[in-house]
C-alpha cells in the first residue's frame, strides 16, 4: 500500500449521532443467515485522527500484548512494531509471547517515501471489539521503519485486509483475513463505516472520540441508509473495481472510461484522498474550479499543499460542487452512483490558524498509479467488502458529514453499455505496485 | 501600468465608522488574476492584514476584526472599499490597499497608504 | 495559530556588507513565504515569494532560501538603498495573514 502520501487518513467523532440518522430510504435487502444482522460488540471499534489512520485494538501474544492497528485495504500484510521507536508508546515483545513462533524470514517493504522492514512470524492474534475468536496468524515484526510510523497517530502497527497477491515478500504468505476465515467460522466478508469529524479534533477529543466501525464477518443495518449497492471485485489483489464515468455537479468529464481506471482503481481504507490519474485530476480540477469560480483559490490549494480557511461555521460549501463516481453494477450494462460532497473533499485541518477558524487541504490530489478512493469516498458510505461474493458494496454512511441542502448519495441503476472495456488491463510485466 | 490609490478622511472620532476607498488605475478591478486587499500598520509596528475582496463580491476577513470590518467592491467605478466600525484609539494606523497576486498568494503591488488618526 | 519570529530585531552592518535575516515559523510552512522590503514613509515592497523567487525587478543581491520552518533572506553586498525594515510573510494558510515582527537593517 502506497505510505508516504497513502497513509494514513482522518476519522473522528460521527457527522450524525445516533439519535439524528438519516431515515432509511428504502426496504432492505432479504436477510443472510449469519451476515446481517446486529454486531454491537463491533459498533464503534475505530479510532482515528485527522489524516493519520483508522486504527481498531488487537491482541498478539500469550499472555495477550494490546496494540492499536491501522486498518488497511490497500495491503496484505499484518505487520506491527516490535522494537522501540520514538513514535511508539508501546510495541510488539516477541520474546514475551509463548507462542510466538519465528520463520526465520525476513521482509522488506519499500514506500515511494519510506518503508519498512522486519521478521516474519507466527502468533495467537484477537480482536478484543470484534469477533470472538483468536487465530494464529503471519505477523512482520517491524525492527526497522522510516516515515512509516507517525508522531501522534496513536497506532503501532498495520492490518493489510487484501488479498494474497499483493502479500510481501509474495503471495504465499496468507494474510490474515484469509487465516481468520479459514480457522473459524467467520463469513468470508467484513464492512467499514469511516466517520469523518467535518472539523478538526484535538488530542483530548481524539481519545474520546469515535472513529467508525468494522464489523467482522457482517453488516450492521445501523450504520447505513437507504440500500446497498454493489460493485464487482474486478481481481482479487487489491479491490480492484471499475469506474465507468465522472460528474461534477452533473456534468460528465466527458473522457473515455479507460483514463479513470489507468492503470487500476482501488478501494483503499489506508490513503486518506481521493488520488486520480494525471489526466482525470486536471480535468476533475479544472472542473472544481470552474464550478467554484466565485471564489478563487491559489494553486498550492489545488494542489493540495495550502489550506484555505473560513471564519468559524462560514464554510462556504454551496460553492463546491458535488463529485459523483459511477461504478459497473452486478448487473449487464447497469452502473450505479456515489455520491460525495465537500464535506468529505475538503479535509478539516487543526493548529493552523486561530481557534475562530475553520482550515482545510483539498483531498484530491494526483496519481502515477490509477484511481484510489481513500477516505474522502470511504467517510460518505458504508462500505461492504463482501470478499465471499466477489464484489463491494455501497450505502449512505449513517455517519457522514452533511448540511442541510445536500447528502452524499448511493443511486441506480443506470444504463451503461460496454463498461468491460473501462478496465486497463496491465502488463504482466509491471507489477511492482508498491513502489509508486 | 497598474497603481493602487487610498483616499478618506484622515481624522475619525472614537466609536464612529473609519472609511477609505481605493481606486486602481491603469488596469481592470475585474481582472480574474487578482484579489483586493487591505493592510494597516500602526505607527511604529508591524503589518496587520484586514481582508480581502474578489470582483464578485466574495470577501475574506482578518477573524480578529471580523465583527466591525466590511469590505466592497464597485466594478463599475473601479474601485474597493473598507469600513471599519466602533473604531478606538488603537485603530490608529496607516491603511494600504493591496494587489494579492502571484496566483492569489502575494501582496505584488501597494498603495502609498493613508494615515487615519483616530482621536476627539 | 502560525507565528513568524524574525530575527535579530536589528541588524547593524555598513555598506558592501553581507546581510542575513531569519525568518522562523512555528510549525512547517513548507515554501509557502514572502519578504517584503519597507523603508520609511513608503508602502512595503515585495522582494521574495515562494520562499526564493526574486520578484519582477528585485536585484540580485537580494535572494531567499529555506523551506518548512526556517526561512533566510540573504543581501549580497549591501547598497546605501537597502537600509530598511523587512518584514517576511506565510501564505500556508490562505489567504495569506501572518507577518513576522520585522528586522531593520541600520548603517552602522
Known amino acids: 500500500t502506497q505510505h508516504g502520501i497513502r497513509l494514513p487518513l482522518r476519522s473522528g467523532l460521527g457527522g450524525a449521532p445516533l439519535g439524528l440518522r438519516l431515515p432509511r430510504e428504502t426496504d432492505e435487502e432479504p436477510e443472510e443467515p449469519g451476515r446481517r444482522g446486529s454486531f454491537v460488540e463491533m459498533v464503534d471499534n475505530l479510532r482515528g485522527k485527522s489524516g493519520q489512520g483508522y486504527y481498531v485494538e488487537m491482541t498478539v501474544g500469550s499472555p495477550p500484548q494490546t496494540l492499536n492497528i491501522l486498518v488497511d485495504t490497500g495491503s496484505s500484510n499484518f505487520a506491527v512494531g516490535a522494537a522501540p521507536h520514538p513514535f511508539l508508546h508501546r510495541y510488539y515483545q516477541r520474546q514475551l509471547s509463548s507462542t510466538y513462533r519465528d520463520l526465520r524470514k525476513g521482509v522488506y517493504v519499500p514506500y515511494t517515501q519510506g518503508k519498512w522492514e522486519g521478521e516474519l512470524g507466527t502468533d495467537l492474534v484477537s480482536i478484543p471489539h470484534g469477533p470472538n475468536v483468536t487465530v494464529r496468524a503471519n505477523i512482520a515484526a517491524i525492527t526497522e521503519s522510516d516515515k512509516f510510523f507517525i508522531n501522534g497517530s496513536n497506532w503501532e502497527g498495520i492490518l493489510g485486509l487484501a488479498y494474497a497477491e499483493i502479500a510481501r515478500p509474495d503471495d504465499s504468505l496468507e494474510p490474515f483475513f484469509d487465516s481468520l476465515v479459514k480457522q473459524t467460522h467467520v463469513p468470508n466478508l467484513f464492512s467499514l463505516q469511516l466517520c469523518g469529524a467535518g472539523f478538526p479534533l484535538n488530542q483530548s477529543e481524539v481519545l474520546a472520540s469515535v472513529g467508525g466501525s468494522m464489523i467482522i464477518g457482517g453488516i450492521d443495518h445501523s450504520l447505513y441508509t437507504g440500500s446497498l449497492w454493489y460493485t464487482p471485485i474486478r481481481r482479487e489483489w487489491y479491490y480492484e473495481v471499475i469506474i465507468v464515468r465522472v460528474e461534477i455537479n452533473g456534468q460528465d468529464l466527458k473522457m473515455d472510461c479507460k483514463e479513470y481506471n489507468y492503470d487500476k482503481s482501488i478501494v483503499d481504507s489506508g490513503t486518506t484522498n481521493l488520488r486520480l490519474p494525471k489526466k482525470v485530476f486536471e480535468a476533475a480540477v479544472k472542473s472544481i474550479k470552474a464550478a467554484s469560480s466565485t471564489e478563487k483559490f491559489p494553486d498550492g490549494f489545488w494542489l493540495g499543499e495550502q489550506l484555505v480557511c473560513w471564519q468559524a461555521g462560514t464554510t462556504p460549501w454551496n460553492i463546491f460542487p458535488v463529485i459523483s463516481l459511477y461504478l459497473m453494477g452486478e448487473v449487464t450494462n447497469q452502473s450505479f452512483r456515489i455520491t460525495i460532497l465537500p464535506q468529505q473533499y475538503l479535509r478539516p485541518v487543526e493548529d493552523v490558524a486561530t481557534s475562530q477558524d475553520d482550515c482545510y487541504k483539498f483531498a484530491i490530489s494526483q496519481s502515477s498509479t490509477g484511481t484510489v478512493m481513500g477516505a474522502v469516498i470511504m467517510e460518505g458510505f458504508y462500505v461492504v467488502f463482501d470478499r465471499a461474493r466477489k464484489r463491494i458494496g455501497f450505502a449512505v454512511s449513517a455517519c457522514h458529514v452533511h448540511d442541510e441542502f445536500r447528502t452524499a448519495a448511493v443511486e441506480g441503476p443506470f444504463v451503461t453499455l460496454d463498461m468491460e472495456d473501462c478496465g486497463y488491463n496491465i502488463p504482466q510485466t509491471d507489477e511492482s505496485t508498491l513502489m509508486t | 501600468q497598474l497603481q493602487l490609490q487610498e483616499s478618506g478622511p484622515g481624522l475619525v472620532k472614537p466609536s464612529e465608522t473609519l472609511s477609505l476607498t481605493c481606486t486602481v488605475s491603469?488596469?481592470?478591478?475585474?481582472?480574474?488574476?487578482?484579489?483586493w486587499s487591505w493592510i494597516r500598520q500602526p505607527p511604529g509596528k508591524g503589518l496587520e492584514w484586514i481582508g480581502n475582496i474578489y470582483y464578485s463580491g466574495s470577501t475574506y476577513y482578518n477573524p480578529s476584526l471580523k465583527s466591525r470590518v466590511t469590505i466592497s467592491v464597485d466594478t463599475s467605478k473601479n474601485q474597493f472599499s473598507l469600513k471599519l466600525s466602533s473604531v478606538t484609539a488603537a485603530d490608529t494606523a496607516v491603511y494600504y490597499c493591496?494587489?494579492?497576486?502571484?496566483?492569489?498568494?502575494?501582496?505584488?503591488?501597494w498603495g502609498r497608504g493613508t494615515l487615519v488618526t483616530v482621536s476627539s | 495559530e502560525i507565528v513568524l519570529t524574525q530575527s535579530p530585531a536589528t541588524l547593524s552592518l555598513s555598506p558592501g556588507e553581507r546581510a542575513t535575516l531569519s525568518c522562523r515559523a512555528s510549525q512547517s510552512v513548507s515554501s509557502y513565504l514572502a519578504w517584503f522590503q519597507q523603508k520609511p514613509g513608503q508602502a512595503p515592497r515585495l522582494l521574495i515569494y515562494?520562499?526564493?523567487n526574486r520578484a519582477t525587478g528585485i536585484p540580485a543581491r537580494f535572494s531567499g532560501s529555506g523551506s518548512g520552518t526556517d526561512f533566510t533572506l540573504t543581501i549580497s553586498s549591501l547598497e546605501p538603498e537597502d537600509f530598511a525594515v523587512y518584514y517576511c510573510q506565510q501564505v500556508y494558510v490562505w489567504p495569506p495573514r501572518t507577518f513576522g515582527g520585522g528586522t531593520k537593517v541600520e548603517i552602522k
Open positions: 491603469g488596469g481592470s478591478i475585474s481582472w480574474s488574476s487578482y484579489y
Open positions: 515562494d520562499a526564493s
Open positions: 493591496a494587489r494579492l497576486g502571484h496566483g492569489y498568494n502575494y501582496f505584488d503591488l
